[in-house]
């Protein structure tokens, strides 16, 4: 293959790969017809003048995961055909000016996971064809004005995981073709008005895991094509009324892990494509009428781990397509009987870890498709007659860890539970709390005659009163319907920042995994 260095492997497809700790300099001679060269996991510490001079047909060059800390300005001379250059995962602190001069065909430049302290306008001034620039995982503290002014064709820019404390409103002004901008995991405290005004083709904006406290009202008003907006894990305490008004294409919005105290009606301006809204881990205390009414296609709404103590009866108006509603780990004591009436397509509702002491009899009246209801860890002593009778698809009902009062009033519920035992799961069953003589006994098998009789005259029960027999074919399938949405929080679907972490039962859905954002 026109001479392949002994420490490399060369394929018929003009691909050369050189790996191993024994390599301390760019191997020679490299095949003159090489089109792809990878130098990975070596002990190369520097690139001298023109080590690639004789392989001018090179299209892709990956020099990754080395000890590289110094590059001579002329290192990439004569690589006019190069389209892809990666220097990721090295130890570069400075880039020489002119390093990329002559790389007229370069489309992708990856400088991520180094130790770069600064970039200058002169660094990229020759890269007029660049489409992708990856600078995440460095030590950048600021981006000077003009740094990207010549990159008019850029479509993807990643500045995540740096130490940026502020952004100039002019730094992105010439990037009219940019589709993806990532600024996650920096130290940004605010974003000046106008910063994103020139980004008319932007589709994804990642601002999560910063320290942003306030959003300017018109911050996103020019970004009509925005589809994914990540604002999670910041310090946002309020949302200006019009901040999301001009985002008709948005299909993913994450706001979890902020300090939001309230949501005003209409705050989520018309977003016909939004399918999921993640608002967990905020400080929301109440939900007013029509707060989500513009989100006609919303399927997943996560409001868990807030401080919600009041939900207005019309709070969920408009959410006719909603499938999953998570309200667990809040401070709910009461729910209006009509609060879920509009949620005709709801399948899963999680209300666990609240302070619910009773439920209205009509709470699930119009929600006929419910498959999973999580009511564990509340303060329920009984449930209204017939509350679940019409829920033919219900196959997961969690009622444990409530102070069930096992007097004669509990009989209708007990009998219904006997008939529907498989829906309760096998791990944990509801147990009686009062009276004291039956405390700790299973609500399902309790002999209510032992318990203290109720002082109330029980209503005629509408629960079925026939006993449950193991061979009865009429009980529903025991398959759990907890969807994958219930198990995980939003996966912000790009590979350079998906960090799954295992949490305990305080996780987003009270299950096993959570996405850190």
């Amino acid at each position: 293959y026109h001479g392949c260095p002994s420490e490399c492997t060369c394929s018929r497809a003009s691909q050369v790969e050189c790996t191993g700790a024994r390599i301390v300099a760019v191997p020679t001679p490299l095949p003159w017809n090489a089109m792809s060269l990878q130098i990975l996991n070596t002990h190369i510490t520097e690139l001298n003048e023109s080590p690639f001079l004789n392989i001018s047909a090179l299209i892709a060059l990956r020099i990754e995961k080395n000890e590289l800390s110094r590059i001579t300005p002329g290192a990439f001379r004569n690589l006019g055909s190069l389209r892809y250059l990666s220097l990721a995962n090295n130890k570069l602190q400075v880039l020489p000016i002119g390093l990329f001069q002559g790389l007229d065909s370069l489309e992708s430049l990856l400088l991520s996971s180094n130790q770069l302290l600064q970039i200058q306008p002169a660094h990229f001034s020759q890269c007029s064809n660049l489409k992708e620039l990856q600078l995440h995982g460095n030590h950048l503290e600021y981006i000077p004005d003009g740094a990207f002014d010549h990159l008019v064709g850029l479509t993807k820019l990643n500045l995540g995981k740096n130490s940026l404390t502020h952004i100039s409103p002019r730094v992105f002004q010439h990037l009219g073709n940019l589709q993806v901008l990532r600024l996650y995991e920096n130290r940004l405290t605010d974003i000046p008005m106008g910063t994103f005004d020139g980004l008319v083709n932007l589709q994804e904006l990642a601002l999560q895991q910063n320290q942003i406290g306030l959003l300017s009202p018109g911050l996103f008003h020019n970004n009509h094509n925005l589809q994914r907006l990540y604002l999670s894990n910041n310090h946002i305490s309020q949302l200006p009324p019009s901040v999301f008004m001009q985002l008709p294409q948005l299909n993913r919005l994450t706001l979890f892990g902020n300090s939001l105290k309230e949501l005003s009606p209409g705050i989520f301006g018309p977003m016909p494509n939004l399918r999921e809204l993640w608002l967990y881990d905020n400080h929301i205390s109440s939900l007013p009428d029509n707060v989500f009414s513009n989100l006609r296609q919303l399927q997943v709404l996560i409001l868990s781990r807030n401080q919600i103590s009041f939900i207005s009866p019309g709070a969920f108006n408009g959410l006719t397509e909603l499938r999953e509603l998570s309200l667990h780990t809040n401070a709910l004591q009461d729910l209006d009987g009509n609060v879920f009436r509009m949620l005709a397509n709801l399948q899963n509702i999680s209300l666990q870890n609240n302070r619910l002491r009773q439920l209205p009899g009509n709470i699930f009246a119009n929600v006929n498709g419910l498959m999973a209801i999580q009511l564990q860890n509340n303060q329920l002593e009984n449930l209204p007659l017939g509350i679940f009778d019409h829920l033919g698809k219900l196959c997961e009902l969690r009622l444990y860890d409530n102070p069930w009062r096992c007097d004669s009033d509990i009989l209708p519920l007990r009998n219904w539970l006997l008939l529907n035992q498989p829906r309760l799961g096998t791990d944990t069953v509801p147990v009686c709390f009062s009276p004291a003589n039956v405390r700790g006994q299973s609500l399902i098998i309790i002999n209510v005659n032992v318990a203290v009789p109720s002082v109330h005259v029980p209503e005629v029960p509408s629960y079925p009163e026939t006993p449950w027999y193991p061979d009865t074919p009429s009980y529903p399938d025991t398959t759990s319907v907890s969807s994958t949405t219930e198990l995980t929080s939003p996966v912000e679907d790009y590979t350079d920042l998906t960090t799954i972490q295992v949490t305990d039962d305080r996780s987003v859905w009270g299950m096993t995994q959570a996405q850190s954002g």
């Epitope: 009773q358 860890d401 147990v431 405390r439």
Partner: antibody, heavy 120, light 112 residues
Framework: EVQLVESGGGLVQPGGSLRLSCAVS????????VHWVRQATGKGLEWLGV???????NYNSALMSRLTISKENAKSSVYLQMNSLRAGDTAMYYC??????????????WGQGTTVTVSS | DIVMTQSPDSLAVSLGERATINCKSS????????????LAWYQQKPGQSPKLLIY???TRESGVPDRFSGSGSGTDFTLTISSLQAEDVAVYYC????????FGGGTKVEIK
Amino acid sequence: EVQLVESGGGLVQPGGSLRLSCAVSGFSLTSYGVHWVRQATGKGLEWLGVIWAGGSTNYNSALMSRLTISKENAKSSVYLQMNSLRAGDTAMYYCATHMHTEDYYGMDYWGQGTTVTVSS
Amino acid sequence: DIVMTQSPDSLAVSLGERATINCKSSQSLLNSRTRKNYLAWYQQKPGQSPKLLIYWASTRESGVPDRFSGSGSGTDFTLTISSLQAEDVAVYYCKQSYNLPTFGGGTKVEIK
């Protein structure tokens, strides 16, 4: 006879962790919840959290990020794990349950407590 | 979180006299549907673990002498010891469980 016995206290370095145990007898953890409460010397009572019969937990919101309560029903033991300890965590740590009281969050049986000192 | 404020911090009362301890919550502890006030009182004698005296603001725990009584509703509550006995010397704490529990700062009762 109902008994709760705390153990695992002692001297811990700042920044370290502790794992306290509460061994119960006279009742089953599958039927009763167990609370953790602490009290600094000469100070008031502070509720830390609870683990219920079915395994659900609630935590003091101010301490939630540092606390984990768990249990092993078969061993009749409840555990309090606390991380990133600081001097302000020095206290007597009690476990308690609601054996006979009608108050779901009432604590009518208490252990004698175990002392935790956070100091370098 | 609901903040519980007790007054006074300490109280010296003659044997046989009435002792009154106040507790104020930062929000109402009355649930309008159950019609219960989620407030409890605990007694802690020197060197001992706390003891539950009263729950739901006014319901005495089994075995608690009837000289102890609780009253109040909403945000203002009172524990009264109608005739102080020597064995009542202790610190008394109120605790709300309307939301996740929080204790008051305690009131020390001594004999004058």
